[in-house]
């Protein structure tokens, strides 16, 4: 039941995460214009991965795509790359991880195999989370260095420019909702690998042998024995089937027909 | 980086016109200028986006007109009856996936 429960939350948590990545890939607000000590007094800019917005002063805003690597920083690219990987992991990892789902019947799937798949589907959103976190990252650290440079730039009028004519850029919504999606999809990702172990199969059977001493001679016993993960309740060795032998707490020193040859 | 190049500055007398144009490197997502005149705050003249809509400063109303071309990697300002108040170093603004300045140009009309 637990097993089920964290399986099914594990599951609708990176759901609930992957949306979010593909929400924050999408959105527009992945940089806004900063507002203090704004040059620009008549519009108000921020950019997405894909397109970049302009809001004037009457409310109108006009949003155009990038239609050229031209004058767009490197780094863009391989923010984006990592977004879309993080996506397609994630819907992978949702498509593997419903066909895993302990209450969803399919066939004569054996547990052995629907805990694999979940395993798989649980690293699949582990990396599709941090897919996610590092392109969010990648760009919030590309948008700091930015700002202080553009800060260094007002103050020092760097290269030229004249002093207040700089724009600066901070932290837009995108970003949160990249991070918190991503994380979401990671802690989703590690339910569904705590869940695998639950799946997985706890005993395995295997032949023993038992040697005990029965008054001058050995008695070889061959017996069927249940060994144990630790995580099952078989931790006194029972037997599974009686093949003559016995545990060692039901051992007895009296002799038996077979004990003299 | 998107690189902006601008011309058509210099002296005039009042009365007179002056064309100004911001080349950019690339195709622009809105352009504009705004000037800066000896010990006064910087203020907008007027910009222009990619569809054409433009925006302009209630002092230059009626006399200055912004236009593009059609790729947007040119934008002009179109400035007539020139007024000794706009004497000013005018800068271009380019914004594309960040905002792009010049180093300016200077506008100087004598009365």
């Known amino acids: 039941m637990a097993v089920t429960a964290c399986q099914g939350l594990g599951f609708v948590v990176s759901l609930i995460g992957i949306a979010g990545i593909i929400a924050a890939t999408c959105m527009d607000q992945w940089s806004t214009q900063d507002l203090y000590n704004n040059p620009v007094t008549a519009v108000f800019n921020y950019q997405g991965l894909w397109r970049s917005c302009v809001r004037e002063s009457s409310g109108f805003t006009e949003c155009r795509g990038y239609f050229t690597l031209l004058g767009l920083p490197a780094m863009l690219q391989a923010v984006r790359a990592l977004m879309i990987v993080g996506i397609v992991l994630g819907a992978i990892g949702l498509l593997v991880s419903i066909f895993a789902l302990k209450c969803i019947r399919i066939g004569s799937m054996e547990d052995s195999a629907k805990a694999n798949m979940t395993l798989t589907s649980g690293i699949m959103f582990i990396v599709s989370g941090l897919c996610a976190i590092a392109g969010v990252s990648v760009f919030a650290n590309m948008l700091v260095t930015n700002f202080w440079m553009s800060t260094a730039n007002m103050y020092t009028g760097m290269g030229g420019m004249v002093q207040t004519v700089q724009t600066r850029y901070t932290f837009g919504a995108a970003l949160f909702v990249g991070w918190v999606a991503g994380g979401l999809t990671l802690i989703g990702g590690v339910m569904m690998c705590i869940a695998c172990r639950g799946l997985a199969p706890e005993e395995t059977n295997y032949k023993a042998v038992s040697y005990h001493a029965s008054g001058h001679s050995v008695a070889y016993k061959p017996g069927g024995f249940k060994a144990s993960t630790g995580f099952g309740s078989n931790t006194k060795n029972k037997k599974i089937y009686d093949g003559g032998a016995r545990t060692e707490d039901e051992v007895q020193s009296y002799p038996s027909k077979h004990d003299y040859v | 980086d998107v690189q902006l190049v601008e011309s058509g500055g210099g002296l005039v007398q009042a009365g007179g016109s002056l064309r100004l144009s911001c080349a950019a490197s690339?195709?622009?997502?809105?352009g504009g200028w705004y000037r800066q005149a000896p010990g006064k705050q910087r203020e907008l003249v007027a910009t222009i986006s990619s569809s054409g809509r433009t925006n302009y400063a209630d002092s230059v109303k009626g006399r200055f007109t912004i236009s593009g071309d059609n790729s947007m990697n040119t934008v002009y300002l179109q400035m007539n009856s020139l007024k000794p108040e706009d004497t000013a170093v005018y800068y271009c603004?380019?914004?594309?996936?960040?905002?792009?300045w010049g180093r300016g140009t200077q506008v100087t009309v004598s009365s």
């Open positions: 603004y380019a914004h594309y996936w960040r905002d792009y």
């Open positions: 690339v195709g622009i997502f809105m």
